[in-house]
Interface confidence: low
C-alpha cells in the first residue's frame, strides 16, 4: 500500500482490546481544505514503541488502514481511498508491546465536517433567575452549532451539561449558578445537524464567583491617638482569599472578590458627611470619634453579606486644654488653635447618657486668635450646658470638613454646666471627736466629684470664734475627710468645707459648730 | 526648617543586616509617619512601609514582610530601618520620607543612605 | 499590585517650552496620586500631592490634574533647573506604588 493512501488489507498485528485504561483517545476528523481532510487524536500512557493506525470503514463494510507511525495527526486527500461524501466510520488502533488498544468509534460525512472553534474573545457572564446566563459572539461563518459546556468547582470533578442547537450571530448557555463556591467553566462547539462531526477545543476557562460572596472575616486593630488628634485604622486580618478550582488560580478575571471598607462617624451629627466607602486596602486615618466600620463583600454578581464592628470613642481626655469663660453676655470655649480655615465641630452630652443624641455645633472655618486660640461662644437663653451636671465635650477639627477620614480630635474634657460653684457645694459635712485635741470632718462628695477631672481640691476652713482665726486645710479631691488637729478645748469653732474645680473657687458650705468639751479630772 | 538627615553609606556581606538611620529635626518628631522607600542603581523608585513614631506602629510592603524592622527613638527623634538576610540585589540607595499632616502623601525626604551588598 | 506607567519615557524640550507627562494607574485612584522630581544624584523633591495640589515651595510653573486612572503633570517655561527625571505615585492602596519614570532632557 502506498503511504498517502488507505490500505485494503488486514493490517500488521492481532485483533484490538479496548478494555483499556491507557491508548488512543478523542479522536476528531474535519476538512480542512477543499480536497483536504485531517484526523488527530490523544495517546494516554507510554509512547515509546507505540505505533498507531487510523482505521476507517465505508458504508459498503469494505475497511481499510492508515499507517502512522508514532505520529497523532494524519492528513489525507480526497484521493487517498476514504470515501469523503458518504458516512464513514473511523477510529484508531495503537500496536504497543504485544497488544493492541483501540479508541472509540466516530461516524461521519467527512465532506460536511467542518473544524468549528470554540466560543472566542468575550464571554458575557450574568444572572438570570438564579441561573447563570453566559453569551458570546458567534464564531465567523459558523452560524448553527450544538454548544456543550463543562463545569467544575474546587473540590468536584469536571462535570458536563448541554446548551442546546444554536443558530443565531450570538450564542448562549444557561447553566447552573453555585451559591457558596466558585466555578470554572468551559465551553465546546460542533455543527449543528452533524452527529458524528467532531467537537472544537473546549473554550479557554470562564471563571465565575459563588452567587453569595464570602462573609469578609477580618479584624481590625485601632491604633492610640496621636498627637495630631489621629488614629490609623490597621488590618490585622485579611479576607481569607476565596478557594479556586485548578483554571481560576491564575490571573483569572471575573471570580474577584472585592472588598470595601464604609466608615461611618458617629460622633458629630452636625457635620457635612458621616459616611465614606473606600477600598480596604487604604486603611484611613480616624479621629478619636466613635464610628461603625462595616466591610462589604461584592463580586460580579453585586454586593453580598457585610460584617460590622463597632470603634468605640478614645476615652482619654486632655488635662485642661479648654478653658470656659462664663460672663453676663454668655459662654465663651477656647482651646488651642489648629491651622487657618480650620472648621471646629463641638459636641457635648450629659456624662451617664451616652445613649442619647449629642448637642453638636459646627464652627465656621476659623482662623487662630493673636493668643493662638480657637473659639465658639453661645448665649445664655440657648441654654446650652445650662443644667447643673456634668458634660463630655469633645472638639473635633478639619481643614475638610467634607472629607470624613480627615477629622482629628482637637481634645476631649469634662465640664459641670450651670452655676457649678453653688451646685458643686459639698453637703452633709458632720464632726466627730477624735482626740483631746483634735476632731475628724466629714462630707459628702461634692457633684463635682461626678466630672473626672474638673473638682481640682476641696478647701476645709476652720475659724476660731474666740480669736476670729481662721485656717484653711487643702484635701486631694478624692478624699471625703480631713482631721484637723492643735484645737483648744472648750473653745467654739465653725468648719465650713468648698469644692474648686481649675478655673472657679466653690460656695462654702452651711457653718458647722462645733468645741471639745474640757475634760475634768478626778 | 524641616530636615531628615541620614546615616552615611554602608558596605556589607550577602546574608548580613543593614540598619539606617533618619533624624528629624525642625518639627515634632512624634506628629507625623515616617515612610522609607528605596532606589535600586539606575532604576525606579520603590515604596517599603512606614513607622508612627507617636507609637511604633509599623506597615510594611508584603516584599519586604519578614526582612525588614522599623523603629524608632523618641527621645533622640531618629527612626531606623534594617533590612536582613541581605542579597546583592538589595544594592540601593534607601531614603526616609516624611508623610505630611492630613494626607498620606509624602513632603519632605532625606538624603538618601547607599547600602551596597558584595561579597 | 496598582501598576502605573508614566509616557513618554524620555523627552527633549528647550528652555522656555511647555511639557506635559502623562501617568496611568491600572485601576482607579481618586486622587491619591503625587509628583516628584529627581535631579541626578539627589532625593527625590515632593511637587504635587492629592493629583493637583501644590507642595509648599514649589513655583506655580508646576502643575497637575486628573483622577481615577489618569494623570498629568505640566512645567511651563522650562528652566535648566527643571531638566530632571519626573516619577508618579500612588498612595491609595498598599503597596504605594511608583511610576517608572520620565527623563526630562535639554534639547
Known amino acids: 500500500c502506498r503511504t498517502s493512501e488507505c490500505c485494503f488489507q488486514d493490517p500488521p498485528y492481532s485483533d484490538a482490546d479496548s478494555g483499556s485504561a491507557s491508548g488512543p483517545r478523542d479522536l476528531s476528523c474535519y476538512r480542512i481544505s477543499s480536497a483536504g481532510y485531517e484526523c488527530s487524536w490523544q495517546y494516554e500512557g507510554p509512547t515509546a514503541g507505540v505505533s498507531h493506525f487510523l482505521r476507517c470503514c465505508l458504508s459498503s463494510g469494505r475497511c481499510c488502514y492508515f499507517a502512522t507511525g508514532s505520529a497523532t495527526r494524519l492528513q489525507f486527500s480526497d484521493q487517498a481511498g476514504v470515501s469523503v461524501l458518504h458516512t464513514v466510520t473511523l477510529w484508531v488502533e495503537s500496536w504497543a508491546r504485544n497488544r493492541t488498544e483501540k479508541s472509540p468509534e466516530v461516524t461521519l460525512q467527512l465532506y460536511k465536517s467542518v473544524k468549528y472553534k470554540p466560543p472566542l474573545g468575550d464571554i458575557k457572564v450574568s444572572k438570570l433567575a438564579g441561573q447563570l446566563r453566559m453569551e458570546w459572539e458567534t464564531p465567523d461563518n459558523q452560524v448553527g452549532a450544538e454548544v456543550q459546556f463543562r463545569h467544575r468547582t474546587p473540590s468536584s470533578s469536571w462535570k458536563l451539561g448541554d446548551c442546546g442547537p444554536q443558530d443565531d450571530d450570538t450564542e448562549s448557555c444557561l447553566c447552573p449558578l453555585e451559591m457558596n463556591v466558585a466555578q470554572e467553566f468551559q465551553l465546546r462547539r460542533r455543527r449543528l445537524g452533524s452527529q458524528g462531526s467532531s467537537w472544537s477545543k473546549w473554550s479557554s476557562p470562564v471563571c465565575v464567583p459563588p452567587e453569595n460572596p464570602p462573609q469578609p472575616q477580618v479584624r481590625f486593630s485601632v491604633e492610640q491617638l496621636g498627637r495630631d488628634g489621629r488614629r490609623r485604622l490597621t488590618l490585622k486580618e485579611q479576607p481569607t482569599q476565596l478557594e479556586l478550582p485548578e483554571g481560576c488560580q491564575g490571573p483569572a478575571p471575573g471570580v474577584e472578590v472585592t472588598y470595601q471598607l464604609q466608615l461611618h462617624m458617629l460622633s458629630c451629627p452636625c457635620k457635612a458627611k458621616a459616611t465614606r466607602t473606600l477600598p480596604l486596602e487604604k486603611m484611613p486615618y480616624l479621629s478619636g470619634a466613635a464610628y461603625n466600620v462595616a466591610v462589604i463583600s461584592s463580586n460580579r454578581f453585586g454586593p453580598g453579606p457585610n460584617q460590622t464592628w463597632h470603634i468605640p470613642a478614645d476615652t482619654h481626655t486632655e488635662p485642661v486644654a479648654l478653658n470656659i469663660s462664663v460672663g453676663t453676655n454668655g459662654t465663651t470655649m477656647y482651646w488651642p488653635a489648629r491651622a487657618q480655615s480650620t472648621t471646629y465641630c463641638i459636641e457635648w452630652q450629659p456624662v451617664g447618657q451616652e445613649g442619647s443624641l449629642a448637642t453638636c455645633n459646627l464652627t465656621a472655618p476659623q482662623d487662630p486668635d493673636p493668643a493662638g486660640m480657637a473659639t465658639y461662644s453661645w448665649s445664655r437663653e440657648s441654654g446650652a450646658m445650662g443644667q447643673e451636671k456634668c458634660y463630655h465635650i469633645t472638639i473635633f477639627a478639619s481643614a475638610h470638613p467634607k472629607k470624613l477620614t480627615l477629622w482629628s480630635t482637637v481634645l476631649s474634657t469634662y465640664h459641670f454646666g450651670g452655676n457649678a460653684s453653688a451646685a458643686g457645694t459639698p453637703h452633709h459635712v458632720s464632726v466627730k471627736n477624735h482626740s483631746l485635741d483634735s476632731v475628724s470632718v466629714d462630707w459628702a462628695p461634692s457633684l463635682l466629684s461626678t466630672c473626672p477631672g474638673v473638682l481640682k481640691e476641696y478647701v476645709v476652713r476652720c475659724r476660731d470664734e474666740d480669736s476670729n482665726q481662721v485656717s484653711e486645710h487643702p484635701v486631694q479631691p478624692t478624699e471625703t475627710q480631713v482631721t484637723l488637729s492643735d484645737l483648744r478645748a472648750g473653745v467654739a469653732y465653725t468648719v465650713q468645707v468648698r469644692a474648686d474645680t481649675a478655673w472657679l473657687r466653690g460656695a462654702w458650705s452651711q457653718p458647722q459648730r462645733f468645741s471639745i468639751k474640757v475634760q475634768v479630772s478626778d | 526648617q524641616v530636615q531628615l538627615v541620614q546615616s552615611g553609606a554602608e558596605v556589607k556581606k550577602p546574608g548580613a543586616s543593614a540598619k539606617v538611620s533618619c533624624k528629624a529635626s525642625g518639627y515634632t518628631f512624634t506628629d507625623y509617619y515616617l515612610h522609607w522607600v528605596r532606589q535600586a542603581p539606575g532604576q525606579g523608585l520603590e515604596w517599603m512601609g512606614w513607622?508612627?513614631?507617636?507609637?511604633?506602629?509599623?506597615h510594611y510592603a508584603q516584599k519586604f514582610q519578614g526582612r525588614v524592622t522599623m523603629t524608632r527613638d523618641t527621645s533622640i527623634s531618629t527612626a531606623y530601618m534594617e533590612l536582613s538576610r541581605l542579597r546583592s540585589d538589595d544594592t540601593a540607595v534607601y531614603y526616609c520620607?516624611?508623610?505630611?499632616?492630613?494626607?498620606?502623601?509624602?513632603?519632605?525626604w532625606g538624603q538618601g543612605t547607599l547600602v551596597t551588598v558584595s561579597s | 499590585d496598582i501598576q502605573m506607567t508614566q509616557s513618554p519615557s524620555s523627552l527633549s524640550a528647550s528652555v522656555g517650552d511647555r511639557v506635559t507627562i502623562t501617568c496611568r494607574a491600572s485601576?482607579?485612584?481618586?486622587?491619591?496620586l503625587a509628583w516628584f522630581q529627581q535631579r541626578p544624584g539627589k532625593a527625590p523633591k515632593s511637587l504635587i500631592y492629592a493629583a493637583s495640589s501644590l507642595q509648599s515651595g514649589v513655583p506655580s510653573k508646576f502643575s497637575g490634574s486628573g483622577s481615577g486612572t489618569d494623570f498629568t503633570l505640566t512645567i511651563s517655561s522650562l528652566q535648566p533647573a527643571d531638566f530632571a527625571i519626573y516619577y508618579c505615585q500612588q498612595y491609595n492602596i498598599y503597596p504605594y506604588t511608583f511610576g517608572p519614570g520620565t527623563r526630562l532632557e535639554i534639547k
Open positions: 485601576q482607579g485612584i481618586g486622587n491619591y
Open positions: 520620607a516624611r508623610e505630611m499632616g492630613g494626607t498620606t502623601a509624602f513632603d519632605y
Open positions: 513607622i508612627n513614631p507617636n507609637n511604633g506602629g509599623t
